[in-house]
């Protein structure tokens, strides 16, 4: 005989759980034990079947979850699952908030990315850092040039995916070139975009010659400027 | 070509449920946020819900949330809209729209492609 | 929520001429990317809307010239340089800034 314990304690890292209203939201928490232990959920520490909210809630024993669609304002609290058997019992807390702000197209900090000169053999980090209300998902474009164009015949410009993420909101993301030679120079462009729209900044590398040894051992490895 | 085509239209009790889908063809459906947008008859134009690229983010009018449901299937090219509890006032014409994409906007960033429509009439 | 404003009500024009609609939203639509983001649409009788600008003042593929879009921050014009018979239609601004995504409430334009 066991008592019950976590079996994917990774997968309950996540504690707080920040959502927009209308989201569907998940708890999960597999567990196992000898006797199989049973699974049951309390909102702000009284049991909770989910009658007196509108669409109800989907409970699935087999995958130790408890499923709420269209989330409103009065779904926020410590939701909590409790896993017992004749052994013993374990839980779990989380908390959920619903966030009711009006979502909006990503935001990028002004200036960045920042327009940069290096000297070829050096490396380079372009940084954008973006705000959001829904998750955004992040690419990095290198503008190219086909057949001596920039430009294809509808006015846009010819562009290449360098690095695509989906990160959280408010971090900083990176694109690192490593050892730039002359061919990485030219524009660069952060394109963040979510639910509601996209939103792009660019910035031009420019990357020189391998400069005097003397004159390079007193100089930094690259130079941001704007 | 990029098409639109909404169904599941129909004449619905107050307090009864139905659900709309969009069928999307001539674009990659599962790279696009998307939209339901309804017009009431001889009315303007009001904003319903959004569902991100993956299906993983989702917004509601006020006047509809929690109550309706926006959802997704990829390997179907479908938008859905599950209408629960309808209301008189929930009786509109209801486009289904394609958002923002993923990847460089050449041209807008979505709001350029609608369906025809279908016609949702709830009443007693 | 952000409302969006539009006048006239009604437009009616004697084809050649030119017809101006205005659109004011209560907030400023101007993003930190530069760019603003109104749109225009016309709505053809019995149809779905029809993009014609998009962010401020760029013409959707296949829009006349004679369409053309301008205004800053809060206080957006559509015009029209010289109105034709299949113009007709109600025009809609809309804010593309932030959900909930809002529209103007229509100018019907009409032939004389």
């Known amino acids: 005989q066991q008592a019950p314990y976590w079996t994917h304690p990774q997968r309950m890292e996540k504690k707080l759980h920040a959502v927009p209203a209308g989201n569907t939201v998940k708890f999960r928490c597999p567990a196992a034990g000898n006797p199989t232990p049973t699974i049951r959920w309390l909102k702000d520490g009284q049991a909770f079947h989910g009658e007196n909210r509108i669409g109800g809630i989907r409970l699935r024993h087999q995958h130790w979850s408890l499923v709420m669609e269209s989330v409103v304002p009065s779904d926020r609290g410590t939701y909590t699952c409790l896993v017992e058997n004749a052994v013993g019992s374990i839980r779990y807390n989380y908390l959920l908030d619903v966030l009711e702000r009006s979502p909006h197209r990503p935001i990028l900090q002004a200036g960045l990315p920042a327009n940069t000169t290096a000297v070829v053999g050096s490396d380079v980090e372009l940084l954008c850092k973006v705000y959001s209300d829904a998750q955004p998902h992040i690419q990095w474009l290198k503008h190219i040039v086909i057949n001596g164009s920039s430009f294809g015949a509808d006015g846009f410009p010819y562009v290449q995916v360098l690095k695509t993420a989906d990160i959280n909101s408010s971090e900083v993301e990176v694109l690192y070139l490593r050892n730039v030679s002359a061919e990485d120079a030219g524009e660069y462009t952060c394109l963040a975009g979510n639910s509601i729209g996209l939103s792009y900044q660019s910035a031009w590398l420019t990357v020189l010659p391998e400069e005097d040894p003397t004159w390079t051992a007193a100089a930094p490895e690259a130079r941001y400027t704007d | 070509e990029v098409q639109l085509l909404e169904s599941g239209g129909g004449v619905v009790q107050p307090g009864r449920s139905l659900r709309l889908s969009c069928a999307a063809s001539?674009?990659?459906?599962?790279?696009?946020?998307m939209h339901w947008v309804r017009q009431a008859p001889g009315k303007g134009l009001e904003w319903v819900a959004v569902i991100s690229y993956d299906g993983s983010n989702k917004y509601y009018a006020d006047s509809v949330k929690g109550r309706f449901t926006i959802s997704r299937d990829n390997s179907k090219n479908t938008l859905s809209l599950q209408m629960n509890s309808l209301r008189v006032e929930d009786t509109a014409i209801y486009y289904c729209?394609?958002?923002?994409?993923?990847?460089?906007?050449?041209?807008?960033?979505?709001?350029?492609?609608w369906g025809q429509g279908t016609m949702v009439t709830v009443s007693s | 929520d952000i409302v969006m404003t539009q006048t006239p009500l009604s437009l009616s024009v004697t084809p050649g001429q030119p017809a101006s609609i205005s659109c004011t939203s209560s907030?400023?639509?101007?993003?930190?990317?530069?760019?603003?983001?109104v749109y225009w649409y016309v709505q053809k009788s019995g149809q779905p809307p029809q993009l014609l600008i998009y962010e401020l003042s760029n013409r959707f593929s296949g829009v006349p010239d004679r369409f053309s879009g301008s205004g800053s921050r809060t206080d957006f014009t559509l015009k029209i340089s010289r109105v034709e018979a299949e113009d007709v239609g109600v025009y809609y601004c809309m804010q593309y800034i932030e959900a909930p995504l809002t529209f103007g409430g229509g100018t019907k334009v009409e032939i004389k």
């Open positions: 001539g674009f990659t459906f599962s790279s696009y946020a």
């Open positions: 907030r400023s639509l101007l993003h930190s990317d530069g760019k603003t983001y």
């Open positions: 729209v394609r958002g923002a994409g993923l990847g460089f906007p050449y041209g807008p960033d979505g709001f350029d492609i």
